[in-house]
């Protein structure tokens, strides 16, 4: 025997109090599938949340965040403060990226610049707080005779070619020094990160999943370290 409730479409519920008649969902509730015995209460977007999509009898409301915040969590169950590019969110609010790191978004953490030398390339454009370094061709590609087909060079005075050679050597030396400096810098940063992990701690952690996304929900109330409430420090 077929369940009479299975005939009730989305936007209705099977009303046991009225001989299993299909009744429309009451205001501020919905049923997204047929055959439901109750309608679910619509989500309400309050506080830092704002309504992105109104609730209807067949679909739930959808929330997003007020300006200056972005969604986190499934279905935007939490909002996190935006920062500027070149910054990351910490316990104390938005802080500039440390030297050697960058963030090109309004959310997330500062990431280390690409180490061009690891790919045997050279730094073409230096990194900033907002942008990663741009890696160029490897130093070998820049050296004379590296290209298999070279157009005949116009005849020049001996003095001129000496100037070009000196300039090239100076540039190569500078590049090598820069690469050595950057490599050393990253080694030191790695050592500091290992030795003093608390310096690099984010304000708020997601507790599930392998890749822990780091977010700022809130810090505890400073005056209640031993017990009491938690509070958000911007």
């Amino acid at each position: 025997l077929q369940d009479p409730c299975s005939n009730c479409p989305a936007g209705t519920f099977c009303d046991n109090n009225r001989n299993q008649i299909c009744s429309p969902c009451p205001p501020n509730s919905f049923s997204s599938a047929g055959g439901q015995r109750t309608c679910d209460i619509c989500r309400q977007c309050k506080g830092v949340f704002r309504t992105r999509k109104e609730c209807s009898s067949t679909s739930n409301a959808e929330c997003d965040c007020t300006p200056g915040f972005h969604c986190l969590g499934a279905g935007c169950s939490m909002c996190e403060q935006d920062c500027k590019q070149g910054q990351e969110l910490t316990k104390k609010g938005c802080k500039d990226c440390c030297f050697g790191t960058f963030n090109d978004q309004k959310r997330g953490i500062c990431r280390p610049w690409t180490n061009c030398s690891l790919d045997g390339k050279s730094v073409l454009v230096n990194g900033t707080k907002e942008r990663d370094v741009v890696c160029g061709p490897s130093p070998a590609d820049l050296s004379p005779g590296a290209s298999s087909v070279t157009p005949p060079a116009p005849a020049r005075e001996p003095g001129h070619s000496l100037q070009v050679l000196t300039l090239f050597l100076a540039l190569t030396s500078a590049l090598l020094l820069a690469l050595i400096f950057i490599t050393l810098l990253f080694s030191v940063l790695k050592w500091i990160r290992k030795k003093f992990p608390h310096i690099f701690k984010q304000p708020f952690k997601k507790t599930t999943g392998a890749a822990q996304e780091e977010d700022a929900c809130s810090c505890r109330c400073p005056q209640e370290e031993e017990g009491g409430g938690g509070g958000y420090e911007l």
Epitope: Q44, G47, G229, G231
Partner: antibody, heavy 118, light 107 residues
Framework: QVQLKQSGPGLVQPSQSLSITCTVS????????VHWVRQPPGKGLEWLGV???????DYNDAFISRLSITKDNSTSQVFFKMNGLQADDTAIYYC????????????WGQGTTLTVSS | DIVMTQSQKFMSTSVGDRVSVTCKAS??????VAWYQQRPGQSPKALIC???YRYSGVPDRFTGSGSGTDFTLTISNVQSEDLAEYFC?????????FGSGTKLEIK
């Protein structure tokens, strides 16, 4: 430092009203909402209502007819008033700050213990 | 109203153990759930919001999980200071509602 300090009477007679003031420091009422939650003796927590940073209020339907929440941003005070008290309104009343990231309570006042008795 | 059910009123555990406090919503609330700890004689303290995001300063032995209707607060390596009552709360819709609480007893 973030603090919510409550002041109010400990004993109220039946049918009288309850007034509690929640004075906040370390944050602004123009940025954060403040909720009111109560806890009857030996029982769980019950949400009563909230006043948002823009001054709008939302109340639990079960209390809407006898509850009023107002605030004064300049003095950083939130005022809670509940009328027509009965014995079953005996509880600890808390003010709590709304988290900036969701609709939850990230910092709580110390609580005001209310006894409704003649 | 959305009813949050914490079926276990009391749970007994020993220091160093792992314990899971459960909470069931009467309808799908996505991940709009927070958890609180209330030590005896104190105000509640926020532990978790958005079902699985830990508040800063909360020890990482506290883990939140779940979505839809079933939610869990797991405390691994239980410490004596974890003796408290734990409440879940939904913020999907008004009225905001709490579970009835689960009291954690340390043997």
């Amino acid at each position: 430092q973030v603090q919510l300090k409550q002041s109010g009477p400990g004993l109220v007679q039946p049918s009288q009203s309850l007034s509690i003031t929640c004075t906040v420091s370390g944050f602004s009422l123009t940025t954060y909402g403040v909720h009111w939650v109560r806890q009857p003796p030996g029982k769980g927590l019950e949400w009563l209502g909230v006043i948002w940073s823009d001054g709008n209020t939302d109340y639990n339907d079960a209390f809407i007819s006898r509850l009023s929440i107002t605030k004064d941003n300049s003095t950083s005070q939130v005022f809670f008033k509940m009328n027509g008290l009965q014995a079953d309104d005996t509880a600890i009343y808390y003010c709590a700050r709304n988290s900036i990231t969701s609709v939850s309570f990230d910092c709580w006042g110390q609580g005001t213990t209310l006894t409704v008795s003649s | 109203d959305i009813v949050m059910t914490q079926s276990q009123k009391f749970m007994s555990t020993s220091v160093g153990d792992r314990v899971s406090v459960t909470c069931k919503a009467s309808q799908n609330v996505g991940t709009t759930v927070a958890w609180y700890q209330q030590r005896p004689g104190q105000s509640p303290k926020a532990l978790i919001c958005s079902a699985s995001y830990r508040y800063s300063g909360v020890p990482d032995r506290f883990t939140g999980s779940g979505s839809g209707t079933d939610f869990t607060l797991t405390i691994s390596n239980v410490q004596s200071e974890d003796l408290a009552e734990y409440f879940c709360q939904q913020y999907n819709s008004y009225p905001l509602t709490f579970g009835s609480g689960t009291k954690l007893e340390i043997k």
